[in-house]
């Protein structure tokens, strides 16, 4: 029977700059029941606070609701593991919410084949930003990426859409069924997961010629 091994805070993520969650990996338990607590202070603060919510984020997590999420403020946090034989502490982790945003995937992905009489046909892709993100405040700039491939192909074709929420693709293989997905990322932060795939059948008469 031993004191617990050193825990590690390995990830912090925010869906929208309004809340965030951090997760830790326990060290070895020393063969004894082990309690974990996360304590933190904000940069410039002389007080320590305990994690406000150990439940919402699941096991080995600490969730900071909107009451406890400050922009432009660094949080300095550590996890303490304690059993009957002693304690061990993780390294301190410095967290700035601005840089840990990972949005939900974009919504309402719509894909349509457009065949104007006077111009080349194209694939028209449209989507909406994730609901948790408030773009009106100007706090957020979301960038988008689209990927698509024929159903049986191994390789994805990737297109960067910038800030726009619609995109045209001209070069497609006629008669193929395509999978299309979109994801987003804030100006600082992480790419979201890809949205659920939308399928589109490209007509056989879809021409790539002028």
């Amino acid at each position: 029977q031993l004191p617990p091994g050193k825990p590690e805070i390995f990830k912090c993520r925010s869906p929208n700059k309004e809340t965030f969650t951090c997760w830790w990996r326990p060290g070895t338990d020393g063969g004894l029941p082990t309690n974990y607590s996360l304590t933190y202070h904000r940069e410039g603060e002389t007080l320590m606070h305990e994690c406000p919510d150990y439940i919402t984020g699941g096991p080995n997590s600490c969730h900071f609701g909107k009451q406890y999420t400050s922009m432009w403020r660094t949080y300095i946090m550590m996890v303490n593991a304690t059993n009957q034989m002693g304690s061990s502490f993780s390294d301190e982790l410095y967290v700035d919410v601005t840089y840990i945003v990972q949005p939900d995937p974009p919504l309402e992905l719509a894909v349509e084949v457009k065949q104007p009489e006077d111009r080349k046909p194209y694939l028209w892709i449209k989507w909406s930003p994730p609901t948790l993100i408030d773009l009106k405040t100007g706090w957020f700039t979301l960038l988008y990426e689209i990927r698509l491939k024929p159903e049986k192909a191994a390789e994805w074709e990737i297109h960067f859409a910038g800030q726009q929420t619609e995109f045209k693709i001209l070069s497609l293989h006629p008669g193929q069924k395509y999978l299309v997905q979109v994801r987003c990322k804030p100006d600082h932060g992480y790419w979201s997961a890809w949205s659920p795939a939308t399928f589109i059948q490209i007509p056989s008469d879809f021409t790539m010629n002028d």
Partner: antibody
Framework: EVQLVESGGGVVRPGGSLRLSCVGS????????MNWVRQGPGKGLEWVSG????????NYAESVKGRFTISRDNARNSLFLQMNSLRAEDTALYYC??????????????WGPGTMVTVSS | EIVLTQSPGTLSLSPGERATLSCRAS???????LAWYRQKPGQTPRLLIY???SRATGIPDRFSGSGSGTDFSLTISRLEPEDFAVFYC????????FGPGTKVDIK
């Protein structure tokens, strides 16, 4: 309208006890850290006690530590201060005060009108 | 405990004049954690400034805050009748503490 209303003040002998209550309305009580601040007659402001919205660790000024106990009931939008072993120097107007955020140690943006506590023999 | 000292203790000025109030801390305070309040006679304190320089909701722009480290100030560009009151600074980097107050009275 956002407001806090205190009650429970009164006159008590040294060594006696009182329980102050505060009820909040017009805002989501459990989104904010809450505090008690007092002001002696003709004196300045003194922070007494506070804690974060989730009722985590309680915090006290040295002058009241071990004698006063803060508690809250978010379901009833209520904050309490149990005051034991009262002394003459605890005589003051006691304000219930809201922190701007979930932390008690924040700027205090809503103040109740106060309830007067007088400790006298 | 972080001790705050305010100066002057009393400031005698006329309506329309500019007032500068000082608050000094016994140790360095991060500017995110300093606030100013006004307390009119017989009334509860009102938050004016938080985070050293951010005006609270509904506070007119004649109030401005500045400073860093251990020295902070509140400036009232033109005194209105309701500004003849006591002003307190407060730090909340640690357990909250208030300064002793500066009284602004009519000259």
């Amino acid at each position: 309208e956002v407001q806090l209303v205190e009650s429970g003040g009164g006159v008590v002998r040294p060594g006696g006890s009182l329980r102050l209550s505060c009820v909040g309305s017009g805002f989501s009580f459990d989104d904010h850290g809450m505090n008690w601040v007092r002001q002696g007659p003709g004196k300045g402001l003194e922070w007494v006690s506070g804690f974060n919205w989730n009722g985590g660790s309680t915090n006290y000024a040295e002058s009241v530590k071990g004698r006063f106990t803060i508690s809250r009931d978010n379901a009833r939008n209520s904050l309490f201060l149990q005051m034991n072993s009262l002394r003459a120097e605890d005589t003051a107007l006691y304000y219930c005060v809201r922190g701007r955020s979930g932390w008690f140690n924040d700027a205090f943006d809503v103040w109740g009108p106060g309830t007067m506590v007088t400790v006298s023999s | 405990e972080i001790v705050l000292t305010q100066s002057p203790g009393t400031l005698s000025l006329s309506p329309g004049e500019r007032a500068t109030l000082s608050c000094r801390a016994s140790q360095t305070i991060n500017s995110n954690y300093l606030a100013w309040y006004r307390q009119k006679p017989g009334q509860t304190p009102r938050l004016l400034i938080y985070g050293t320089s951010s005006r609270a909701t509904g506070i007119p722009d004649r109030f401005s805050g500045s400073g860093s480290g251990t020295d902070f100030s509140l400036t009232i560009s033109r005194l209105e009748p309701e500004d003849f009151a006591v002003f307190y600074c407060q730090q909340y980097a640690g357990l909250p503490t208030f300064g002793p107050g500066t009284k602004v009275d009519i000259k």
